[in-house]
């Protein structure tokens, strides 16, 4: 089980002559919505055939009114993803139809009128759990840009969402026979939920509720050891009553592999080796040819004229991957200046600028002091994108609006008392100390160790600090 997700990036006039008329007008404002239809395999994209994989309808986009005389721009889009849940395995190849609908919001009798603006269709190969694939499709004069992916819903994992995962019970390794779940290496493949009581050591299942026995064990829950002394056949499900192995159907009996695939037994199940042009658990997914348009983003498809010959996508600059579905990491060139963060949005690079910088590449150093006044005679100092005021004596705070208390920092040493003064502070020193901040001890004979007190000022008198 999983979800197919579709993100519409833009819908608007395509390149070239003959730009379409805007679908909305001042008289008839409208809004867009989208419908997606998915079908497994490379089926014909007849709009009428059922959407066997599922379908979804978007929310309505914002209301749009054409500006008279202006060319039709990219139209406002609905928010969010279109999500198509799928219950079974993801097929690997799929066909899609994406329809763009217009909802007219004029004064129609009986509510809004709907009309189909554009329909695009295609066939693609896609593994679940992979990155977003980007696509551009044209319908007449319109162009639709979108991305899509298929992701598995826990506990399912894998390219087809057929493997199950669960958190590890032990920190270092998975249980016997269970592999780590790439790419979730901290989880393990979980066995299917077999029939209640089915022996975890000697039984297994391919379908929920089943209990199939490993060689040497029998019984409905695979708890009965097989006695082979009176038996001729070396394998097969056994008779629970005799405990004797009797010939029975093996996992490869009847060859479950389609399209000429060869089957080999594995300890728990079977494995198909598929001929060229086919893949999947049972070789049920047919090969993709160049006619299926497997190369994205304008990639050139070479070879692959029939399902038995592989195709190769020659990607245009800026794209890579076997289907040209991956964009080259353009941010590795670090185009953003002044420590800006580079974001590759696909259609463009964007820079997220640090505080104090602006512009498409963060090239503009904002004048932090422009339009900012520091009060009470303070001066503005620029730095690192944040303005700062250097305040005049007696004032503080971000904009020098707060009257500073010069005594707050307890500037008078040795128990001196601080008094605020219009031009600063005054320290009244404790007996035995002197100096502007009472920092000098007075010797018993009245001489100080450092500069003498100014004439007319006895030790112990208040010292004014300017």
């Amino acid at each position: 089980a999983g979800v197919f997700e579709l993100q519409i990036h833009s819908f608007g006039p395509g390149p070239g002559p003959g730009a379409p008329r805007s679908p909305c007008s001042a008289r008839l404002p409208c809004r867009l919505f989208f419908r997606v239809c998915l079908k497994p395999g490379l089926s014909e994209e007849a709009a009428e055939s059922p959407c066997a994989l599922g379908a979804a309808l978007s929310a309505r986009g914002p209301v749009y009114t054409e500006q008279p005389g202006a060319p039709a721009p990219d139209l406002p889009l609905p928010d969010g993803l279109l999500q198509v849940p799928f219950r079974d395995a993801w097929p690997g190849t799929f066909s899609f139809i994406i329809e763009t609908w217009r909802e007219e919001l004029g004064d129609q009798i009986g509510g809004p009128a709907w009309s189909l603006l554009a329909r695009v269709a295609g066939r693609r190969r896609l593994a679940a759990g992979g990155p977003w694939a980007r696509d551009i499709q044209r319908a007449g004069a319109w162009e639709l840009r979108f991305s899509y992916r298929a992701r598995c819903e826990p506990p399912a994992v894998g390219t087809a969402c057929t493997r199950l995962c669960r958190p590890r019970s032990a920190p270092s390794r998975c249980g016997p026979g269970l592999r780590p779940c790439a790419p979730l290496e901290d989880e393990c493949e979980a066995p299917l939920v077999c029939r209640a009581g089915c022996s975890p050591e000697h039984g297994f299942c391919e379908q929920p509720g089943e209990c199939r026995c490993l060689e040497g064990w029998t019984g409905p829950l695979c708890t009965v050891p097989v006695s082979t002394s009176s038996c001729l056949s070396p394998r097969g499900p056994s008779s629970a009553t005799t405990g004797c192995l009797v010939p029975g159907p093996g996992p490869c009996d009847g060859n479950p592999c389609a399209n000429g695939g060869s089957c080999s037994e594995t300890p728990r199940s079977f494995e198909c080796t598929c001929p060229r042009g086919f893949y999947g658990l049972r070789c049920e997914v047919s090969g993709v040819t160049c006619a299926d348009g497997p190369c994205f983003n304008g990639g050139l498809c070479v070879g692959g004229a029939d399902p038995d010959s592989a195709y190769i996508c020659h990607c245009p600059p800026g794209f890579q991957g076997s289907n040209c579905e991956k964009r080259v990491d353009r941010c590795s060139l670090q185009p953003c200046r002044n420590g800006g963060l580079c974001l590759d949005l696909g259609h463009a690079l964007r820079c997220r600028c640090r505080a104090g910088f602006a512009g498409p590449r963060c090239e503009h150093d904002l004048d932090d002091c422009a339009g900012r006044a520091c009060a009470n005679g303070g001066t503005c100092v620029e730095g690192g994108g944040a303005h700062r005021c250097s305040c005049a004596l007696g004032f503080g705070g971000r904009d020098c609006r707060e009257r500073a208390d010069p005594c707050a920092a307890r500037p008078c040493a040795h128990g001196g008392r601080c008094y605020a003064h219009f031009s600063g502070l005054v320290c009244a020193c404790a007996p035995g100390y002197m100096g502007a901040r009472c920092e000098f001890p007075v010797h018993p004979d009245g001489a100080s160790a450092l500069p003498a007190a100014p004439p007319g000022l006895r030790p112990g008198d208040p010292q004014r600090y300017l």
Epitope: R330, Q334, L349, P360, R361
Partner: nanobody, 120 residues
Framework: EVQLVESGGGEVQPGGSLRLSCAAS????????MGWYRQAPGKQRELVAG???????IYAESVKGRFTISRDNAKNTVYLQMSSLRAEDTAVYYC??????????????WGQGTLVTVKP
């Protein structure tokens, strides 16, 4: 329209040297970040060397000390001097530029690529 035209690729023996050039032409206001990427068969495209938006030079670890990038702003041209070439340097080398157009928009452009082959 902006074009990036690469030249200087070719075949060289291990230990040899090549100098690649990339000239940007068209409605360019200024070239911001500019550099060289390469793509070997079956591999992802990777940055080899470049000038960042802050005009710093950056190099892939595998080419440090062997390759040198330089630029001529007046000619809107970037160069890649490649020395002590190895077989693993064989790839198509692409010029890339984050260009500011006269419309003041920025666009990221790629050249068509030039093949460098290192073999005995």
């Amino acid at each position: 329209e902006v074009q990036l035209v690469e030249s200087g690729g070719g075949e060289v023996q291990p230990g040899g040297s090549l100098r690649l050039s990339c000239a940007a032409s068209g409605s360019i206001f200024s070239s911001n970040a500019m550099g060289w990427y390469r793509q070997a068969p079956g591999k992802q495209r990777e940055l080899v060397a470049g000038f960042t938006g802050d005009t710093n030079t950056i190099y892939a670890e595998s080419v440090k000390g062997r390759f040198t990038i330089s630029r001529d702003n007046a000619k809107n041209t970037v160069y890649l001097q490649m020395s002590s070439l190895r077989a693993e340097d064989t790839a198509v080398y692409y010029c890339a530029a984050d260009v500011q157009l006269f419309s003041r928009d920025y666009e990221f452009y790629w050249g068509q690529g030039t093949l460098v082959t290192v073999k005995p």
